[in-house]
Protein backbone atom coordinates (compact mmCIF):
# COMPACT_ATOMS: atom_id res chain seq x y z
CA UNK A 1 0.00 0.00 0.00
CA UNK A 2 1.61 3.58 -0.62
CA UNK A 3 0.99 6.10 2.06
CA UNK A 4 1.37 9.50 2.60
CA UNK A 5 3.54 9.52 5.53
CA UNK A 6 6.72 12.25 5.30
CA UNK A 7 9.83 9.76 4.06
CA UNK A 8 13.16 11.55 5.24
CA UNK A 9 14.29 10.34 2.25
CA UNK A 10 12.56 12.98 0.21
CA UNK A 11 15.15 16.23 0.19
CA UNK A 12 18.37 15.29 -0.96
CA UNK A 13 20.89 18.61 -1.73
CA UNK A 14 23.36 18.93 -4.32
CA UNK A 15 25.60 22.36 -4.48
CA UNK A 16 23.03 25.19 -4.44
CA UNK A 17 20.23 22.80 -5.88
CA UNK A 18 17.69 20.74 -4.32
CA UNK A 19 16.72 17.24 -5.60
CA UNK A 20 13.27 15.52 -4.52
CA UNK A 21 12.56 12.22 -4.56
CA UNK A 22 9.11 10.64 -5.04
CA UNK A 23 8.99 6.92 -4.35
CA UNK A 24 6.21 4.37 -5.99
CA UNK A 25 6.22 0.48 -6.01
CA UNK A 26 8.30 -1.11 -8.48
CA UNK A 27 5.07 -3.24 -9.54
CA UNK A 28 3.70 0.18 -11.15
CA UNK A 29 4.56 -0.04 -14.80
CA UNK A 30 2.85 3.08 -16.19
CA UNK A 31 2.33 6.20 -13.97
CA UNK A 32 1.85 9.76 -13.99
CA UNK A 33 3.89 11.50 -10.96
CA UNK A 34 3.43 15.17 -10.02
CA UNK A 35 5.01 17.45 -7.70
CA UNK A 36 3.31 19.98 -5.77
CA UNK A 37 4.83 22.92 -3.60
CA UNK A 38 1.82 24.02 -1.74
CA UNK A 39 -1.27 23.49 -4.92
CA UNK A 40 0.98 24.64 -7.30
CA UNK A 41 2.18 22.07 -9.64
CA UNK A 42 5.66 22.32 -10.68
CA UNK A 43 6.54 18.76 -12.35
CA UNK A 44 4.97 16.54 -13.98
CA UNK A 45 6.22 12.80 -15.48
CA UNK A 46 4.16 10.32 -17.28
CA UNK A 47 5.73 7.27 -18.10
CA UNK A 48 3.57 4.96 -20.55
CA UNK A 49 4.29 2.29 -22.42
CA UNK A 50 3.44 1.75 -26.35
CA UNK A 51 3.59 -1.00 -28.95
CA UNK A 52 6.34 -3.61 -28.16
CA UNK A 53 6.74 -2.13 -24.76
CA UNK A 54 8.37 0.64 -25.92
CA UNK A 55 8.78 3.08 -22.82
CA UNK A 56 7.30 6.54 -23.60
CA UNK A 57 8.21 9.79 -20.99
CA UNK A 58 5.93 12.92 -21.08
CA UNK A 59 8.00 15.52 -19.54
CA UNK A 60 5.56 18.93 -20.47
CA UNK A 61 7.11 21.02 -17.55
CA UNK A 62 10.76 20.31 -19.21
CA UNK A 63 11.85 19.57 -15.48
CA UNK A 64 15.16 17.84 -15.15
CA UNK A 65 14.48 14.32 -13.66
CA UNK A 66 15.60 11.08 -13.09
CA UNK A 67 13.64 8.27 -13.93
CA UNK A 68 14.33 4.58 -11.66
CA UNK A 69 12.07 1.62 -11.73
CA UNK A 70 10.64 2.61 -8.02
CA UNK A 71 11.18 6.48 -7.76
CA UNK A 72 11.45 10.14 -10.09
CA UNK A 73 13.43 12.64 -8.77
CA UNK A 74 13.12 16.15 -9.38
CA UNK A 75 15.91 18.21 -9.71
CA UNK A 76 15.58 22.24 -8.62
CA UNK A 77 18.28 24.52 -9.62
CA UNK A 78 18.92 27.52 -7.24
CA UNK A 79 15.78 27.33 -5.31
CA UNK A 80 15.10 30.84 -3.83
CA UNK A 81 13.14 31.55 -0.87
CA UNK A 82 9.78 31.88 -2.49
CA UNK A 83 10.23 27.67 -2.04
CA UNK A 84 10.16 27.60 1.64
CA UNK A 85 7.12 25.50 1.31
CA UNK A 86 5.38 22.34 1.64
CA UNK A 87 5.98 20.16 -0.94
CA UNK A 88 4.61 17.05 -1.67
CA UNK A 89 4.32 13.98 -4.77
CA UNK A 90 1.21 12.75 -6.01
CA UNK A 91 1.17 9.36 -7.78
CA UNK A 92 -1.29 8.25 -10.72
CA UNK A 93 -1.26 4.82 -11.46
CA UNK A 94 -2.52 3.45 -14.48
CA UNK A 95 -1.12 -0.17 -14.92
CA UNK A 96 -1.53 -2.14 -12.95
CA UNK A 97 -5.28 -1.75 -12.85
CA UNK A 98 -7.25 -0.24 -10.84
CA UNK A 99 -6.28 3.03 -11.74
CA UNK A 100 -5.56 4.68 -8.10
CA UNK A 101 -4.31 7.92 -6.88
CA UNK A 102 -2.25 8.95 -4.23
CA UNK A 103 -0.97 12.18 -2.53
CA UNK A 104 3.17 10.04 -1.44
CA UNK A 105 5.53 11.74 0.66
CA UNK A 106 5.40 15.44 1.61
CA UNK A 107 8.23 17.20 3.20
CA UNK A 108 8.48 21.53 4.40
CA UNK A 109 11.75 23.01 2.69
CA UNK A 110 13.12 26.08 3.93
CA UNK A 111 15.80 28.19 2.60
CA UNK A 112 17.92 30.32 4.83
CA UNK A 113 19.42 33.45 2.37
CA UNK A 114 20.26 30.74 -0.57
CA UNK A 115 21.63 27.86 1.82
CA UNK A 116 19.50 24.80 1.30
CA UNK A 117 17.47 23.73 5.27
CA UNK A 118 15.58 20.83 4.92
CA UNK A 119 13.16 20.53 8.16
CA UNK A 120 10.50 17.35 7.86
CA UNK A 121 6.50 18.18 9.13
CA UNK B 1 45.13 36.44 1.61
CA UNK B 2 43.11 33.46 3.55
CA UNK B 3 40.36 35.25 5.37
CA UNK B 4 37.65 33.93 7.88
CA UNK B 5 34.55 35.06 6.49
CA UNK B 6 31.44 32.59 6.04
CA UNK B 7 31.18 31.22 2.40
CA UNK B 8 27.89 29.62 1.57
CA UNK B 9 29.47 27.02 -0.42
CA UNK B 10 30.93 25.69 2.66
CA UNK B 11 28.07 23.22 2.97
CA UNK B 12 26.14 20.86 0.74
CA UNK B 13 23.97 18.28 1.05
CA UNK B 14 23.73 14.57 -0.40
CA UNK B 15 21.35 12.11 1.16
CA UNK B 16 21.68 12.59 4.73
CA UNK B 17 25.24 13.60 4.48
CA UNK B 18 26.97 16.47 4.73
CA UNK B 19 29.91 17.66 2.37
CA UNK B 20 31.96 20.82 4.33
CA UNK B 21 34.26 22.38 1.52
CA UNK B 22 37.44 23.74 3.19
CA UNK B 23 39.66 26.23 0.24
CA UNK B 24 42.59 26.78 -0.05
CA UNK B 25 44.84 29.00 -2.42
CA UNK B 26 45.95 26.79 -5.11
CA UNK B 27 49.60 28.25 -4.57
CA UNK B 28 49.78 26.14 -1.22
CA UNK B 29 51.89 22.81 -2.10
CA UNK B 30 51.75 21.17 1.50
CA UNK B 31 48.98 22.02 4.31
CA UNK B 32 47.13 20.54 6.92
CA UNK B 33 43.12 20.89 6.91
CA UNK B 34 41.64 20.29 10.08
CA UNK B 35 37.45 20.31 10.55
CA UNK B 36 36.39 21.75 13.54
CA UNK B 37 33.12 21.81 15.38
CA UNK B 38 33.12 23.88 18.18
CA UNK B 39 36.31 23.51 19.54
CA UNK B 40 36.45 19.88 18.87
CA UNK B 41 38.50 18.89 15.68
CA UNK B 42 36.69 16.06 13.23
CA UNK B 43 38.66 15.24 10.29
CA UNK B 44 42.24 16.40 9.93
CA UNK B 45 44.19 15.73 6.29
CA UNK B 46 47.54 16.45 5.51
CA UNK B 47 49.31 16.63 2.10
CA UNK B 48 52.87 16.32 2.37
CA UNK B 49 55.25 15.89 -0.34
CA UNK B 50 58.39 13.49 -0.42
CA UNK B 51 61.31 12.13 -2.23
CA UNK B 52 60.81 12.42 -6.25
CA UNK B 53 57.84 14.73 -5.66
CA UNK B 54 55.32 11.84 -4.68
CA UNK B 55 52.41 13.20 -2.73
CA UNK B 56 51.63 11.49 0.80
CA UNK B 57 48.24 12.37 2.47
CA UNK B 58 47.58 11.28 6.28
CA UNK B 59 44.23 10.68 7.17
CA UNK B 60 44.22 10.03 11.06
CA UNK B 61 40.62 9.93 12.24
CA UNK B 62 39.68 8.22 9.19
CA UNK B 63 37.08 10.56 7.21
CA UNK B 64 35.42 10.34 4.22
CA UNK B 65 37.28 13.02 1.96
CA UNK B 66 37.58 14.54 -1.61
CA UNK B 67 40.83 16.69 -2.06
CA UNK B 68 41.37 18.87 -4.82
CA UNK B 69 44.08 21.77 -5.77
CA UNK B 70 42.22 24.11 -3.62
CA UNK B 71 39.69 22.53 -1.69
CA UNK B 72 39.79 19.14 0.98
CA UNK B 73 36.37 18.28 1.30
CA UNK B 74 34.93 15.97 4.25
CA UNK B 75 31.84 14.31 4.41
CA UNK B 76 30.03 13.32 7.74
CA UNK B 77 27.83 11.15 7.34
CA UNK B 78 24.65 10.82 9.37
CA UNK B 79 24.94 13.85 11.62
CA UNK B 80 22.86 13.91 14.45
CA UNK B 81 21.23 17.04 16.39
CA UNK B 82 24.36 17.43 18.50
CA UNK B 83 25.80 18.14 15.24
CA UNK B 84 24.00 21.61 15.07
CA UNK B 85 26.85 23.72 15.85
CA UNK B 86 29.63 26.23 14.42
CA UNK B 87 31.80 24.45 11.75
CA UNK B 88 35.15 25.91 10.57
CA UNK B 89 37.99 25.04 8.76
CA UNK B 90 42.06 25.52 10.29
CA UNK B 91 44.86 25.24 7.63
CA UNK B 92 48.21 24.98 8.10
CA UNK B 93 50.34 25.70 4.84
CA UNK B 94 54.02 24.15 5.28
CA UNK B 95 54.68 25.05 1.63
CA UNK B 96 55.42 27.10 0.59
CA UNK B 97 57.18 29.65 3.44
CA UNK B 98 56.59 30.88 5.77
CA UNK B 99 54.39 28.22 8.06
CA UNK B 100 51.37 29.60 8.34
CA UNK B 101 48.08 28.31 10.13
CA UNK B 102 44.77 30.62 9.62
CA UNK B 103 41.28 29.78 10.50
CA UNK B 104 39.14 29.65 7.12
CA UNK B 105 35.64 29.80 6.58
CA UNK B 106 32.87 29.36 9.35
CA UNK B 107 29.08 28.55 9.34
CA UNK B 108 26.28 27.05 11.37
CA UNK B 109 25.16 24.25 10.56
CA UNK B 110 21.93 23.21 11.89
CA UNK B 111 19.75 19.85 12.36
CA UNK B 112 16.04 19.06 12.49
CA UNK B 113 15.26 15.68 13.38
CA UNK B 114 17.90 13.98 11.48
CA UNK B 115 17.17 16.48 8.30
CA UNK B 116 20.40 18.57 7.20
CA UNK B 117 20.05 22.34 7.75
CA UNK B 118 22.55 24.59 6.80
CA UNK B 119 22.31 28.51 8.12
CA UNK B 120 25.25 30.48 7.40
CA UNK B 121 25.34 33.60 10.73
CA UNK C 1 58.29 19.92 26.69
CA UNK C 2 59.51 18.11 24.10
CA UNK C 3 62.31 15.66 24.57
CA UNK C 4 64.49 14.17 21.75
CA UNK C 5 66.68 11.38 23.27
CA UNK C 6 69.31 9.20 21.18
CA UNK C 7 70.95 6.19 22.30
CA UNK C 8 72.74 3.04 20.80
CA UNK C 9 76.06 4.90 19.66
CA UNK C 10 79.70 3.39 21.18
CA UNK C 11 82.92 2.27 19.59
CA UNK C 12 82.37 -0.61 16.28
CA UNK C 13 85.02 -1.61 14.43
CA UNK C 14 85.10 -0.85 10.66
CA UNK C 15 82.73 -3.39 8.96
CA UNK C 16 80.34 -3.76 12.26
CA UNK C 17 76.92 -2.85 13.03
CA UNK C 18 74.96 -0.80 15.07
CA UNK C 19 71.66 0.23 15.55
CA UNK C 20 70.40 4.09 17.00
CA UNK C 21 67.37 4.90 18.71
CA UNK C 22 65.33 7.96 19.16
CA UNK C 23 62.93 8.43 21.60
CA UNK C 24 60.19 11.46 21.74
CA UNK C 25 58.72 12.50 24.54
CA UNK C 26 56.10 15.63 25.05
CA UNK C 27 54.49 15.40 20.99
CA UNK C 28 52.49 13.66 18.93
CA UNK C 29 55.23 11.46 17.11
CA UNK C 30 53.24 10.04 14.32
CA UNK C 31 52.47 14.30 13.06
CA UNK C 32 56.41 14.70 12.50
CA UNK C 33 58.54 13.64 9.52
CA UNK C 34 62.18 12.77 11.52
CA UNK C 35 65.64 12.81 9.96
CA UNK C 36 68.88 12.10 11.38
CA UNK C 37 72.10 14.50 10.52
CA UNK C 38 75.11 13.72 12.07
CA UNK C 39 78.25 15.62 12.59
CA UNK C 40 81.90 14.63 12.60
CA UNK C 41 84.67 15.52 15.51
CA UNK C 42 84.96 19.37 14.83
CA UNK C 43 83.14 19.66 11.51
CA UNK C 44 79.85 20.71 10.15
CA UNK C 45 76.95 19.17 9.61
CA UNK C 46 75.63 16.28 7.53
CA UNK C 47 72.26 14.96 6.86
CA UNK C 48 72.20 11.04 6.99
CA UNK C 49 68.58 9.92 6.26
CA UNK C 50 64.43 10.88 6.35
CA UNK C 51 61.65 9.56 7.18
CA UNK C 52 57.67 10.46 6.74
CA UNK C 53 55.72 9.66 9.34
CA UNK C 54 53.83 6.65 8.80
CA UNK C 55 57.58 4.86 7.37
CA UNK C 56 56.09 5.05 3.57
CA UNK C 57 58.57 7.91 2.66
CA UNK C 58 62.40 7.14 3.20
CA UNK C 59 65.34 9.15 1.87
CA UNK C 60 69.62 8.61 2.47
CA UNK C 61 72.53 10.90 1.31
CA UNK C 62 74.84 8.80 -1.08
CA UNK C 63 77.30 8.55 1.57
CA UNK C 64 75.15 6.01 3.59
CA UNK C 65 73.16 4.66 0.69
CA UNK C 66 72.87 0.93 1.37
CA UNK C 67 74.34 0.13 4.39
CA UNK C 68 72.01 2.69 6.48
CA UNK C 69 68.18 1.89 7.32
CA UNK C 70 65.86 4.45 9.08
CA UNK C 71 62.34 3.12 10.48
CA UNK C 72 60.18 4.22 13.13
CA UNK C 73 57.77 2.52 15.63
CA UNK C 74 55.18 4.94 16.08
CA UNK C 75 53.52 3.25 18.72
CA UNK C 76 56.70 3.37 20.51
CA UNK C 77 57.68 7.18 19.80
CA UNK C 78 60.66 5.91 18.45
CA UNK C 79 62.92 6.66 15.40
CA UNK C 80 65.61 4.00 14.55
CA UNK C 81 68.90 4.04 12.04
CA UNK C 82 70.29 0.68 11.60
CA UNK C 83 74.00 1.03 10.33
CA UNK C 84 75.89 -1.71 8.74
CA UNK C 85 79.25 -1.99 6.97
CA UNK C 86 80.25 0.72 9.12
CA UNK C 87 83.43 3.08 7.88
CA UNK C 88 85.64 5.63 9.72
CA UNK C 89 84.55 8.47 8.26
CA UNK C 90 81.37 7.26 9.95
CA UNK C 91 82.57 8.47 13.00
CA UNK C 92 80.41 11.73 14.54
CA UNK C 93 77.97 12.62 16.78
CA UNK C 94 74.73 11.90 15.49
CA UNK C 95 71.22 13.60 16.06
CA UNK C 96 67.66 12.78 15.61
CA UNK C 97 65.71 15.90 14.31
CA UNK C 98 61.96 16.88 13.96
CA UNK C 99 60.24 18.05 10.71
CA UNK C 100 59.38 22.32 12.05
CA UNK C 101 55.64 22.27 10.81
CA UNK C 102 54.40 18.66 12.01
CA UNK C 103 53.69 18.41 8.43
CA UNK C 104 54.48 14.35 8.57
CA UNK C 105 57.12 14.97 6.30
CA UNK C 106 60.86 15.36 6.17
CA UNK C 107 61.17 16.69 3.13
CA UNK C 108 60.84 20.07 2.13
CA UNK C 109 61.15 21.02 5.89
CA UNK C 110 63.79 22.67 8.21
CA UNK C 111 64.54 21.22 11.32
CA UNK C 112 63.22 22.70 14.66
CA UNK C 113 64.09 19.96 17.71
CA UNK C 114 66.83 18.21 17.71
CA UNK C 115 68.16 15.80 20.27
CA UNK C 116 71.42 15.95 22.44
CA UNK C 117 73.60 13.74 20.30
CA UNK C 118 74.94 10.13 20.41
CA UNK C 119 78.47 9.18 19.70
CA UNK C 120 79.44 6.83 17.06
CA UNK C 121 83.24 5.70 16.29
CA UNK C 122 84.28 3.28 14.45
CA UNK C 123 88.22 2.48 14.96
CA UNK C 124 90.19 -0.47 14.46
CA UNK D 1 73.94 17.71 -4.96
CA UNK D 2 73.82 21.46 -3.80
CA UNK D 3 76.62 22.87 -2.68
CA UNK D 4 76.01 25.63 -0.17
CA UNK D 5 79.27 27.85 0.65
CA UNK D 6 79.39 30.22 3.11
CA UNK D 7 81.55 33.14 3.88
CA UNK D 8 83.61 34.37 5.68
CA UNK D 9 84.28 31.77 7.47
CA UNK D 10 85.03 33.44 10.72
CA UNK D 11 83.77 36.90 11.83
CA UNK D 12 85.31 38.81 14.34
CA UNK D 13 83.61 41.56 16.07
CA UNK D 14 82.14 43.20 18.78
CA UNK D 15 78.97 43.09 20.98
CA UNK D 16 76.26 45.43 19.70
CA UNK D 17 78.03 45.61 16.22
CA UNK D 18 75.87 44.42 13.05
CA UNK D 19 76.74 40.55 11.74
CA UNK D 20 76.04 40.02 7.92
CA UNK D 21 76.44 35.94 6.55
CA UNK D 22 76.49 35.03 3.29
CA UNK D 23 75.64 31.72 2.14
CA UNK D 24 75.69 30.82 -1.49
CA UNK D 25 74.89 27.61 -3.18
CA UNK D 26 75.80 25.84 -6.03
CA UNK D 27 72.48 25.81 -7.79
CA UNK D 28 69.17 27.36 -7.31
CA UNK D 29 67.14 27.11 -4.54
CA UNK D 30 63.65 26.95 -5.56
CA UNK D 31 60.88 28.30 -3.48
CA UNK D 32 63.47 29.57 -0.76
CA UNK D 33 64.04 26.55 1.02
CA UNK D 34 66.86 27.71 2.64
CA UNK D 35 67.45 27.87 6.72
CA UNK D 36 69.62 28.68 9.12
CA UNK D 37 70.75 27.59 12.16
CA UNK D 38 72.92 28.52 15.38
CA UNK D 39 74.93 26.16 17.05
CA UNK D 40 77.40 27.17 20.19
CA UNK D 41 79.61 24.29 21.53
CA UNK D 42 78.51 21.30 23.25
CA UNK D 43 74.60 21.70 22.05
CA UNK D 44 72.40 20.73 19.24
CA UNK D 45 72.13 23.42 16.51
CA UNK D 46 69.53 25.55 16.87
CA UNK D 47 66.80 26.94 13.95
CA UNK D 48 66.74 30.36 13.70
CA UNK D 49 65.28 31.08 10.05
CA UNK D 50 63.69 29.18 7.32
CA UNK D 51 61.93 29.91 4.55
CA UNK D 52 64.96 32.15 3.56
CA UNK D 53 63.25 34.92 5.55
CA UNK D 54 61.00 33.82 7.99
CA UNK D 55 61.87 33.59 11.85
CA UNK D 56 61.22 30.21 14.10
CA UNK D 57 59.49 30.43 16.84
CA UNK D 58 61.08 32.52 20.44
CA UNK D 59 63.62 33.72 18.01
CA UNK D 60 64.67 37.81 18.31
CA UNK D 61 63.95 40.20 15.92
CA UNK D 62 67.56 40.89 15.76
CA UNK D 63 68.20 38.02 13.26
CA UNK D 64 66.57 38.35 10.03
CA UNK D 65 67.40 36.63 6.81
CA UNK D 66 67.11 37.42 2.87
CA UNK D 67 68.04 36.36 -0.35
CA UNK D 68 66.84 34.26 -3.10
CA UNK D 69 68.13 31.96 -5.65
CA UNK D 70 71.40 31.01 -4.73
CA UNK D 71 72.36 33.88 -2.59
CA UNK D 72 71.31 34.26 0.90
CA UNK D 73 72.46 36.34 3.97
CA UNK D 74 71.62 35.96 7.70
CA UNK D 75 72.29 39.50 9.11
CA UNK D 76 71.86 40.16 13.19
CA UNK D 77 71.76 43.46 13.92
CA UNK D 78 73.09 43.83 16.90
CA UNK D 79 75.42 41.36 18.51
CA UNK D 80 74.03 40.01 21.90
CA UNK D 81 77.26 37.92 24.17
CA UNK D 82 75.15 35.10 23.60
CA UNK D 83 74.71 35.19 19.66
CA UNK D 84 78.95 34.39 19.86
CA UNK D 85 78.46 30.84 17.89
CA UNK D 86 78.56 28.87 14.66
CA UNK D 87 76.20 29.67 12.17
CA UNK D 88 75.33 26.70 9.53
CA UNK D 89 72.72 27.66 6.06
CA UNK D 90 70.55 24.48 5.50
CA UNK D 91 68.99 23.89 1.77
CA UNK D 92 66.05 21.71 1.90
CA UNK D 93 64.77 21.74 -1.68
CA UNK D 94 66.95 18.85 -3.31
CA UNK D 95 67.71 15.61 -1.51
CA UNK D 96 70.28 14.57 -0.40
CA UNK D 97 69.46 17.91 1.67
CA UNK D 98 72.80 19.76 2.32
CA UNK D 99 74.83 22.40 5.36
CA UNK D 100 77.14 24.51 4.45
CA UNK D 101 80.41 24.51 6.03
CA UNK D 102 79.77 26.86 8.50
CA UNK D 103 80.68 30.91 9.47
CA UNK D 104 82.21 30.88 12.95
CA UNK D 105 80.91 34.88 14.96
CA UNK D 106 83.60 35.40 17.34
CA UNK D 107 83.87 38.33 19.66
CA UNK D 108 87.15 40.59 18.59
Known amino acids: EINGSADHRMFSFHNGGVQISCKYPETVQQLKMRLFREREVLCELTKTKGSGNAVSIKNPMLCLYHLSNNSVSFFLNNPDSSQGSYYFCSLSIFDPPPFQERNLSGGYLHIYESQLCCQLK | EINGSADHRMFSFHNGGVQISCKYPETVQQLKMRLFREREVLCELTKTKGSGNAVSIKNPMLCLYHLSNNSVSFFLNNPDSSQGSYYFCSLSIFDPPPFQERNLSGGYLHIYESQLCCQLK | EVQLVESGGGVVRPGGSLRLSCVASGVTFDDYGMSWVRQAPGKGLEWVSGINWNGGDTDYSDSVKGRFTISRDNAKNSLYLQMNSLRAEDTALYYC?????????????????WGQGILVTVSS | EIVLTQSPGTLSLSPGERATLSCRASQSVSRSYLAWYQQKRGQAPRLLIY???SRATGIPDRFSGDGSGTDFTLSISRLEPEDFAVYYCHQYDMSPFTFGPGTKVDIK
Open chain 3, 97 to 113: ARDFYGSGSYYHVPFDY
Open chain 4, 51 to 53: GAS
